[in-house]
């Protein structure tokens, strides 16, 4: 028997479902009653889901894990994963047993978007060209950690005086905050792009000031 | 026939460790599940972990995941449970079982395992 | 976990009753099994997926039910069926079993 698995690893998003395929060809007369198929970890060896003895043995993992019952038979021994979350990330092995066995391995990716930017100054009133200020850029909730990018309004990148913070919280997911510190000119405009790299998602905030008051552009 | 042999009694201190073994034979070792369910003087029975010797995938009670270790190995077609810091508690008779459908069809003749100092 | 509760935990009957032990699923599982254990024995597999019986086990003994609610029935008690009787699931994980029901001779 030979196993087939994506080569690609799986994105899914966090807190949807991701199916990570698995395929062997049965011979002809095949029945359920001669197959072994169980996904394990594949660091660990831990248990994710079986079907052995003509048998479902269902989930061995948060009972968020299932089979497609109606297609083993034509061999299709994909994995659906519900709801999917951060420490679900990793390599899967798929392990398939008739009269001689095969197994292969497939990656899950998760990941999740960055929320739009939101930007803070301090201080935030009676700036004057000169002066010192901490511009703040903050957006939550993604997953894996950020690439922050600063620029200036002619798209002259910024990278001295940058420290970003990325904190996971109890889901796993990371909330960013980057700090540039800069000497304002007479007028000027600075944005943060933060990007996910599995999605290739990239979310922008700006700041504008411009004389007295200083103000924020409209969000898109 | 299909036959499961298990290791001779022990008496062990607490805080130790002990490791029983389950010779099998009558039957294709690797196509099959194999459990280890304990039962301690005058109580009901408590699975506490199964492994697939052909796949190497195990699952483990979340009672026991911390203390015990359930490994195989194919060439002599015997499985191992091995617990570890062992207390007066886990004075228990420790079964290894062969999976049928999904039920554990046959039962070794139990290891009596004595926690005592 | 799926807890199963058998009832009753002790019984008294005589040769020839009619005897039936249910076991109650804290959820719905898929099927029941049950063991027989004399003292001093391995468990013995009795019932496989609810009615099915085992390879050798009498025709006296036999296995109904569904959802939560699952009985073992010994239509003709013989004296070699006095033993302690057990549930158990493999719906979810952990594999569980009931706390077993010991069968006396009155």
């Known amino acids: 028997v030979e196993v087939q698995v994506s080569e690609d690893p799986v994105v899914a998003l966090v807190d949807t479902d991701a199916t990570l395929r698995c395929s062997f060809s049965p011979e002809p007369g095949f029945s359920l009653a001669q197959l072994n198929l169980i996904w394990q970890l594949t660091d660990t060896k831990q248990l994710v889901h079986s079907f052995t003895e003509g048998r479902d043995q269902g989930s061995a993992y948060s009972n968020r894990t299932a089979l497609f019952p109606d297609l083993l038979v034509q061999g299709n021994a994909s994995l659906r994963l519900q709801r999917v979350r951060v420490t679900d990330e990793g390599s899967y092995t798929c392990f398939v047993s008739i009269q001689d066995f095969d197994s292969a391995a497939v990656s899950l990716q998760v990941a999740a978007p960055y929320s739009k930017p939101s930007m803070t100054l301090e201080p935030n009133k009676d700036l004057r060209p000169g002066n010192m200020v901490t511009i703040t850029c903050s957006s939550y909730q993604g997953y894996p950690e950020a690439e922050v990018f600063w620029k200036d309004g002619q798209g002259v990148p910024l990278t001295g005086n940058v420290t970003t913070s990325q904190m996971a919280n109890e889901r796993g997911l990371f909330d960013v905050h980057s700090v540039l510190r800069v000497v304002l000119g007479a007028n000027g405009t600075y944005s943060c792009l933060v990007r996910n790299p599995v999605l290739q998602q990239d979310a922008h905030g700006s700041v504008t000031i411009t004389g007295q008051p200083l103000t924020f552009p409209p969000e898109a | 026939q299909v036959q499961l042999v298990q290791s001779g009694a022990e008496v062990v201190k607490p805080g130790a460790s002990v490791k029983v073994s389950c010779k099998a034979s009558?039957?294709?070792?690797?196509?099959?599940?194999m459990h280890w369910v304990r039962q301690a003087p005058g109580q009901g029975l408590e699975w506490m972990g199964m492994?697939?010797?052909?796949?190497?995938?195990?699952n483990y009670n979340e009672r026991f995941k911390t203390r015990v270790t359930i490994t195989v190995d194919k060439s002599t077609s015997t499985a191992y449970m091995e617990l570890s810091s062992l207390r007066s508690e886990d004075t228990a008779v420790y079964y290894c079982?062969?999976?049928?459908?999904?039920?554990?069809?046959?039962w070794g003749q139990g290891t009596l395992v004595t926690v005592s100092s | 976990d799926i807890q199963l509760t058998q009832s009753p935990s002790f019984l008294s009957a005589s040769v020839g009753d009619r005897v039936t032990i249910t076991c109650s699923a804290s959820?719905?599982?898929?099927?029941m099994y049950w063991y027989q254990q004399k003292p001093g024995k391995s468990p013995k597999l009795l019932i496989y997926?609810?009615?099915n019986l085992a390879s050798g086990v009498p025709s006296r003994f036999s296995g109904s039910g569904s959802g939560t609610e699952y009985t073992l029935t010994i239509s003709s008690l013989q004296p070699e069926d006095f033993a302690t009787y057990y549930c158990?699931?493999?719906?979810?994980?952990?594999?569980?079993f009931g706390q077993g029901t010991k069968l006396e001779i009155k």
């Open positions: 079982a062969r999976s049928t459908a999904l039920a554990t069809g046959y």
């Open positions: 009558g039957y294709t070792f690797t196509n099959y599940w």
């Open positions: 492994i697939h010797p052909n796949s190497g995938a195990f």
């Open positions: 959820s719905s599982v898929s099927y």
């Open positions: 997926d609810t009615s």
């Open positions: 158990q699931q493999w719906s979810s994980y952990p594999l569980t």
